[in-house]
């Protein structure tokens, strides 16, 4: 009899068997019948081992061994063994941020009887591999719960019968798609032509971000450093060298593994600052012994829309005015508290139209006509007085909470024209006649 038939090794097309027989008679001949669904064949050997060749991958073979000595046949013994499936090939991967759909091929005739074992391993984390086993004959699988923007390796073994696997797995590296930034916020930087962008890091891994800033024909593309989503930190970057009071289209794209996510977009407008001071000075002309006409051009709106103008008069030295003069009124002037005061206020919004950057409006103000604008009284001027005029332009005008109707110069965004040349008023004709 033959016993302890042992499959020493098996490949796709070969099988090495050895066995034992009860005595050491060397004259035994061992007759082998090799059967599979493809048919059967016979071979003989004097050895207690044989290598069977030319087998078909992934096929179940029944091998029956019968000993014979002097034409007397002993009891046969059998074993059943699959050859290994061929390795899978042509692995194809399609990904989204958290899943990968894998498909592959196996060209063995027996492949409809194979199942496949997939081992998915995140780069640098071999201890935590995911295993997926397909149903028989299925050559695709979707692996879920992956981490966005991360590198993975998949190994795919074909298997048949009781876990007889291909000698080598098919291997493929792939990356999941990076996650887009959910959103980002823009903050203006006070009195700076800049924007601060703030975001929380998207889930998963990233190598960095592409930042695109665009306004009209102007655009700028730059890279941003990578971030980590682990601790929910808020990340920020400052975009500088912009224009004031300008709308910008901003796009941020996550990058990882050479892949780019869908861009996240926002439209943001930069802040304002003091208007650029005009080159010229207002034009002042005498109208009567107690009034003048002040003509001036609107300030350039490149630092923000002009919200208001204040007409300032002085009888003093025409130094450069400061925001401090905005608190003085006609009443202060009459009391002698100041030789400079605000006589008239123009709120440009009241004109019911928006001024474009290039459009320069002309203003003509009658000073001394006893009108009142907010807290400022446009009182009569003094005959024989010498007056100069200056204009303050505001991109932001703030009023004192406690001094109703008076401008808070420190809190406002303001710049001043130069003072005009002085104009001297004539004598009151009533005095001459009298």
């Amino acid at each position: 009899a033959v016993f302890d038939i042992h499959v020493v090794y098996v490949t796709t097309t070969e099988m090495w068997l050895d066995w034992k027989s009860p005595d050491g008679a060397s004259e035994y001949v061992y007759h082998l019948v090799i059967e599979s669904k493809h048919g059967s064949n016979h071979t003989s050997t004097y050895d207690k081992a044989i290598t069977l060749q030319g087998l078909i991958p992934g096929t179940l073979y029944n091998i029956t061994i019968s000993p014979e000595v002097d034409h007397v046949w002993g009891d046969p013994n059998s074993t059943a063994q699959y050859t290994r499936p061929s390795n899978v090939s042509n692995i194809d991967v399609s990904t989204n941020t958290t899943a990968a759909t894998l498909s592959w091929q196996n060209f063995d005739d027996a492949s409809p009887t194979y199942s496949y074992c997939l081992l998915i391993e995140k780069a640098g984390n071999s201890s935590n591999a995911t295993q997926v086993v397909t149903d028989i004959g299925i050559t695709d699988a979707t692996v879920t719960e992956l981490i966005p923007g991360s590198s993975y390796t998949v190994e795919i073994f074909a298997q048949v019968g009781d876990g007889i696997k291909s000698l080598e797995p098919g291997r493929k590296s792939f990356c999941t798609d990076p996650a887009s930034m959910a959103s980002f916020d823009c903050e203006v930087v006070p009195k700076e032509p800049a924007l601060v962008l703030k975001w929380t890091c998207p889930p998963g891994a990233n190598a960095g971000f592409e930042l695109e800033v665009s306004s009209g024909a102007w655009n700028n593309a730059t890279h941003l450093e990578s971030c980590s989503s682990e601790n929910g930190t808020e990340y920020r970057t400052e975009v500088t060298y912009l224009n004031f009071s300008t709308s910008y289209n901003i796009s941020i794209t996550t990058v990882s593994c050479g892949k780019m996510a869908a861009p996240t977009r926002n439209t943001c407008t930069t802040g304002i600052t003091d208007p650029p001071p005009p080159d010229g000075s207002p034009n002042i002309t005498s109208v009567s012994h107690n009034s003048v006409k002040v003509k001036f051009s609107g300030f350039e709106a490149s630092h923000g829309p002009i919200k208001a103008y204040a007409v300032i008069l002085t009888t003093g030295e025409a130094g450069h005015p400061s925001a401090d003069v905005l608190k003085y009124t006609y009443e202060d002037f009459k009391k002698g508290a100041s030789d400079t005061y605000v006589t008239y206020l123009i709120r440009t919004e009241e004109k019911g139209r928006s001024q474009s950057l290039s459009e320069v409006l002309k203003y003509e103000i009658d000073v001394g006509n006893e009108s009142t604008t907010l807290g400022y009284y446009n009182g009569k001027l003094e005959p024989l007085g010498s007056y100069r005029a200056c204009v303050a332009g505001f991109t932001n005008i703030t009023f004192h909470p406690q001094n109703k109707g008076l401008i808070d110069g420190a809190e406002s965004y303001v710049s001043f024209s130069r003072y005009s040349d002085a104009v001297s008023l004539p004598q009151d004709p009533g005095v001459i006649c009298g």
């Epitope: 960095g208 890279h223 794209t253 861009p263």
Partner: antibody, heavy 117, light 107 residues
Amino acid sequence: EVKLVESGGGLVQPGGSLKLSCAASGFTFSNYYMAWVRQAPTKGLEWVAYITNGFGSTYYRDSVKGRFTISRDNAKSTLYLQMDSLRSEDTATYYCSTVPLGAFVSWGQGTLVTVSS
Amino acid sequence: DIQMTQTPHSLSASLGETVSIECLASEGISNYLAWYQQKPGKSPQLLISHANPLHDGVPSRFSGSGSGTQFSLKIRNMQPEDEGVYYCQQGYKFPYTFGAGTKLELK
């Protein structure tokens, strides 16, 4: 699998025009910054033009500015390079490429442009 | 423009040898440095981006290092398929610029 296939190259006289195309597949074309890179015969590599994904902003090397125009059709997953006023020094193999974070990651097989009289 | 100076211009190495190619940027480029391999008649292939991460499918015998202005590409255990021209490239600032290339041959 990312695939980029350039076409439209050929022989053109100095001063002439040519339009190159790059058909993209296997990835979401509209997400990607794209570029053209060229290589003169037996010479090194030279970046030519670049287009962003968000607003389609374009950038060019100085020597082609005003003569070349890069554009994209996201619906057709195609990148273009319109080349006008061609010069002999524009003779090269032109490659299209994806460009995340300033690296030319995936390349096409290239298309040869020869400018000669 | 940022100049990328690559050294050496060419080199030959024996099978199994380790080789190094250097790249010097004329100004700081952070880590926006990529390495490419080009074989005759073929398109360039990205090996390394961001100074050191290997691109998908690139053998681990390739490695990159450096930041700022000085970078290097190291190839350990030289193989016949490593023959070709190697280029460095900065992606920090327009115009993106390449080194002149290093031709690597098998001895």
